[in-house]
């Protein structure tokens, strides 16, 4: 389970590397961060490393209510402040690693840790 | 109503330290970003730098950074800028400014503080 | 770091006058622009957020607009107490946070 982590946490971290370049990993971390109510990897300061976004900017993903821009020049009360690795892996380890078996090539660095059937799945539960 | 009340300014040495401290009240002093800003006799606003709401996030000025340290005290609502290694150039009034952020601009200003360096 | 540039730098108008003072953008800000007034010796007081929107408080003769990289602050009739300088001030990408260079309104 902690290799399962330590590879959820450096492919996300990896994921928001790619974030303002590909508009795919854009829209899947951002299902993610608003879905599971978190921003960043361990939290949302994170997002201030990423070098090519804006250091007083999150994704919009990352508001409490979002709307276009809610992300630019943000305020922490606005903002979800908790990491998604924890709170994803948390929901992992509770929802699926308990029901699946996970190969190691599924945790390849390219490779979705986390399927799209089982985000619509947090979602609707 | 809401004040910002600045402290700490005075005259000192090149080199000399200072801490500024500013008293919040009136307001919710965690819901807001905080800045210092200065203005040097007859010249325009420099922001200095600010700090996030919780502390977690602190960027300064080129002109002041490995020099000077903000930070807060949410307990007390009080904000603080640590001076060290002044020069003859950080001379100037400072000012506690909070920030609402987002697209809100900086809407309350303290009176300021002086800081006079010469030697 | 976005540079933000005003114009004029100092201004000679009279009571009853309508002013308008620039503000550019070295780069797109959208409409995260912020205008504030400061007299002498006193703090500097915000007056317009949002390039448009107006401060509670704020006489309606100030109004400001533009998106992007060109703004202004208009003062539709001015009245004695508008003497003083304003700032442009950007808050779309920071640190720094990035004023204007002041323009000084003077009585003609």
């Known amino acids: 389970r902690d290799k399962v982590m330590s590879e959820f946490n450096n492919n996300f971290r990896q994921q928001m590397e790619n974030y303002p370049k590909n508009n795919h990993t854009a829209s899947i971390l951002d299902r993610m961060q608003a879905d599971f109510k978190c921003c960043g990897a361990a939290n949302y300061t994170d997002w201030e490393k990423i070098p090519s976004m804006s250091k007083n900017r999150v994704p919009d993903s990352c508001c409490i209510n979002v709307t276009v821009g809610c992300g630019i020049n943000f305020n922490e009360k606005a903002i979800h402040k908790e990491g998604c690795v924890e709170k994803i892996g948390g929901w992992l380890r509770k929802n699926v690693l308990e029901q699946k078996l996970i190969s190691e090539e599924d945790l390849g660095g390219e490779q979705k840790l986390i399927s799209e059937e089982d985000l619509h799945h947090h979602h609707h539960h | 109503q809401v004040q910002l009340v600045e402290s700490g300014g005075g005259l000192v040495k090149p080199g000399g330290s200072l801490r500024l401290s500013c008293a919040t009240s009136?307001?919710?002093?965690?819901?807001?970003?905080m800045n210092w800003i200065r203005q040097a006799p007859g010249k325009g606003l420099e922001w200095v730098s600010y700090i996030s709401n919780s502390g977690s996030i602190r960027y300064y000025a080129d002109s002041v950074r490995g020099r000077f340290s903000i930070s807060r005290d949410n307990a007390k609502n009080s904000l603080y800028l640590q001076m060290s290694s002044l020069r003859a150039d950080d001379t100037a009034v400072y000012y506690c400014v909070r920030d609402p952020r987002q697209i809100y601009g900086m809407d309350v200003w303290g009176q300021g503080t002086t800081v006079t360096v010469s030697s | 770091d976005i540079q933000m540039t005003q114009s004029p730098s100092s201004l000679s108008a009279s009571v009853g006058d309508r002013v308008t003072i620039t503000c550019r953008a070295s780069q797109s800000i959208s409409s995260y622009l912020n205008w504030y007034q400061q007299k002498p010796g006193k703090a500097p007081k915000l007056l317009i957020y949002a390039a448009s929107s107006l401060q509670s408080g704020v006489p309606s003769r100030f109004s400001g607009s533009g998106s992007g990289t060109d703004f202004t602050l208009t003062i539709s009739s001015l009245q004695p107490e508008d003497f003083a300088t304003y700032y442009c001030?950007?808050?779309?990408?920071?640190?720094?946070?990035?004023f204007g260079q002041g323009t000084r309104l003077e009585i003609k």
């Open positions: 009136g307001f919710t002093f965690t819901d807001y970003f």
């Open positions: 001030q950007q808050s779309y990408s920071t640190p720094p946070i990035t």
